[in-house]
Interface confidence: medium
């Protein structure tokens, strides 16, 4: 009764299609698979960025897999062939591992790469990234930004740079069609006549870096003798009402400061007839139903009631 063996996949490699971190892991079938023609051979793939403690594990029948990686670090992967127990009349058979690595040969010392990279997706409409030049780089150093997300045929270079002293220090992106809820990859590389410049790679999802506009049309309405309803409208733009959280700051008679976070465009405030002055401001942020993270908007313009009976007047800014 001969022991059943299976070979590992052939030509296992990590292929960089030029998408700034979105890599293909590819392999060829093992030799001598024809013995198992009636059987679905599977592959167990493990991969990670070098330095990560955990492996991602995938079991697939395909000969390729795609995922995003941090190209600032190396990548390691390993794969083996699996013969399910149905193929072997017994227990699952595994081949030995085939292993591969991939990294981009770094140019320049780490200090030459851009510093303090910051990207904000203003009002879910306009992406702007800014950075500071690397430490100790000369004025002849210029940085170039490239970006890619699934849907683009190839990585694109920024066409509208923000400049300071002749150096690129940021990028205003064009309209980015169908670019949210997927990984957005950026590489900022550089060139200098004096020394090589280290490239930097960044990955994020646009919906997680949205900074909305502040809410507008703040109003007061007296609901009862002891309640005032504060209302406002969602900011103009593409973000639907269901995607907002709000933070309100309310000041009564220059003494009491109320801070509250709410999900709707209203807030009911308990007050007294003695209230002589009421002011509030609101800011907005994309909520957990639409993103994993976000940036608070600027505060709205202040809306105040002063010296008049709130029961007689609704104030509209």
């Amino acid at each position: 009764d001969t022991e059943i063996k299976v070979n590992p996949p052939q030509d296992f490699e990590i292929v960089d299609p030029g998408y700034l971190g979105y890599l293909y892991l590819q392999w060829q079938p093992p030799l001598s698979l024809d013995h198992f023609k009636e059987c679905t051979v599977e592959y167990e793939l493990k991969y990670r960025n070098i330095g990560s403690e955990t492996w991602k594990t995938i079991i697939t029948k395909n000969l390729h897999y795609k995922d995003g990686f941090d190209l600032n670090k190396g990548i390691e992967a390993k794969i083996h062939t699996l013969l399910p127990w149905q193929c072997t009349n017994g227990s699952e058979v595994q081949s030995s591992w085939a292993e591969t690595t991939y990294w981009i040969s770094p140019q320049g010392i780490p200090e030459t790469k851009v510093q303090d990279m910051d990207c904000v997706y203003y009002n879910w409409q306009y992406l702007l990234c800014s950075w500071k030049p690397g430490i100790g780089v000369l004025l002849d150093t210029n940085y170039n930004l490239f970006y890619w997300y699934e849907g683009l045929d190839h990585a694109l270079q920024c066409v509208d740079y923000i400049k300071a002293d002749g150096q690129n220090i940021g990028c205003r992106f064009p309209y980015l069609e169908a670019s949210d809820y997927k990984d957005f990859y950026i590489c900022v590389n550089g060139s200098s006549e004096n020394k090589p410049i280290r490239s930097s790679y960044f990955t994020f999802q646009l919906q997680n870096i949205v900074k909305p506009l502040p809410p507008v049309y703040l109003t007061f309405t007296r609901e009862s003798s002891c309640e005032i309803k504060l209302k406002w409208s969602i900011p103009l733009g593409p973000i639907p009402a269901r995607c907002f959280d709000y933070e309100i700051e309310i000041r009564e008679d220059d003494t009491t400061l109320v801070t509250a976070t709410v999900e709707n465009e209203t807030y009911t405030l308990k007050t007294t007839n003695e209230t002589r002055q009421l002011c509030f401001v609101v800011r907005s942020k994309v909520n957990i139903y639409c993103s994993d993270d976000g940036i608070w908007s600027e505060w709205s313009d202040k809306q105040c009631w002063e010296g008049e009976d709130l029961s007689k007047k609704t104030l509209l800014r």
Partner: antibody
Framework: EVQLVESGGGLVQPGGSLRLSCAAS????????MSWVRQAPGKGLEWVAT????????YYADSVKGRFTISRDNAKNSLYLQMNSLRAEDTAVYYC???????????????WGQGTLVTVSS | DIQMTQSPSSLSASVGDRVTITCKAS??????VAWYQQKPGKAPKLLIY???YRSTGVPSRFSGSGSGTDFTLTISSLQPEDFATYYC?????????FGGGTKVEIK
């Protein structure tokens, strides 16, 4: 339409060099291994070299090892064959061929270019 | 290296004939054999891979069989456009060698 177009062939003297190119279109080039296969006038097919999809794995026929170099540029959808120290017996039509791949099989050639003629003669 | 020995080297047949071409590998290659058709002045065209799997668009009159060392390409009813040279190739392990070819001519 899936297409492979070879170029770079011509007449070269023995000991000379030539670089063949193959432009691929109509498929995701970086997903397939690629090969060069040649055919001497009036003779059969001879496999020359293969490069894997990412370029990490390269295989040569003994008859060209050390003289020919296969390479690819996935960004340009191009395959190359650098031929040095050419001999009269290298005279052939050189075909660029895509490596077909199925779940159980690989290394057969499912798409071929039209070929480019290399003549090595003094 | 694995050698592929093809026979016959040529044959004459008429339209409608059943034609069989054989290929023998010098060692066991499982089912890793492909068959190609080539017409004068043209590039080869894949017919069969993995011994018996027809490539996309190949007519059903072409079939392949065999495993181990002995393989067969059969054309069940020869058509005028089938007059050409046929090659086998093993796709088991490098180097990937071809048979010497079989020229199918009009009788």
């Amino acid at each position: 339409e899936v297409q492979l177009v070879e170029s770079g062939g011509g007449l070269v003297q023995p000991g000379g060099s030539l670089r063949l190119s193959c432009a691929a279109s109509g498929f995701t080039f970086s997903r397939n291994g690629m090969s060069w296969v040649r055919q001497a006038p009036g003779k059969g097919l001879e496999w020359v070299a293969t490069v894997s999809s990412g370029g990490s794995y390269i295989y040569y026929a003994d008859s060209v090892k050390g003289r020919f170099t296969i390479s690819r540029d996935n960004a340009k959808n191009s395959l190359y064959l650098q031929m040095n120290s050419l001999r009269a017996e290298d005279t052939a039509v050189y075909y660029c061929a895509r490596q077909g791949t199925t779940a159980l099989a690989t290394r057969f050639f499912d798409v071929w270019g039209q070929g480019t003629l290399v003549t090595v003669s003094s | 290296d694995i050698q592929m020995t093809q026979s016959p080297s040529s044959l004459s047949a008429s339209v409608g004939d059943r034609v069989t071409i054989t290929c023998k590998a010098s060692q066991d290659v499982g089912t890793a054999v492909a068959w190609y058709q080539q017409k004068p002045g043209k590039a080869p065209k894949l017919l069969i891979y993995s011994a018996s799997y027809r490539s996309t668009g190949v007519p059903s009159r072409f079939s392949g069989s065999g495993s181990g060392t002995d393989f067969t390409l059969t054309i069940s009813s020869l058509q005028p456009e089938d007059f050409a040279t046929y090659y086998c190739q093993h796709h088991y392990s490098a180097p990937w060698t071809f048979g010497g070819g079989t020229k199918v001519e009009i009788k």
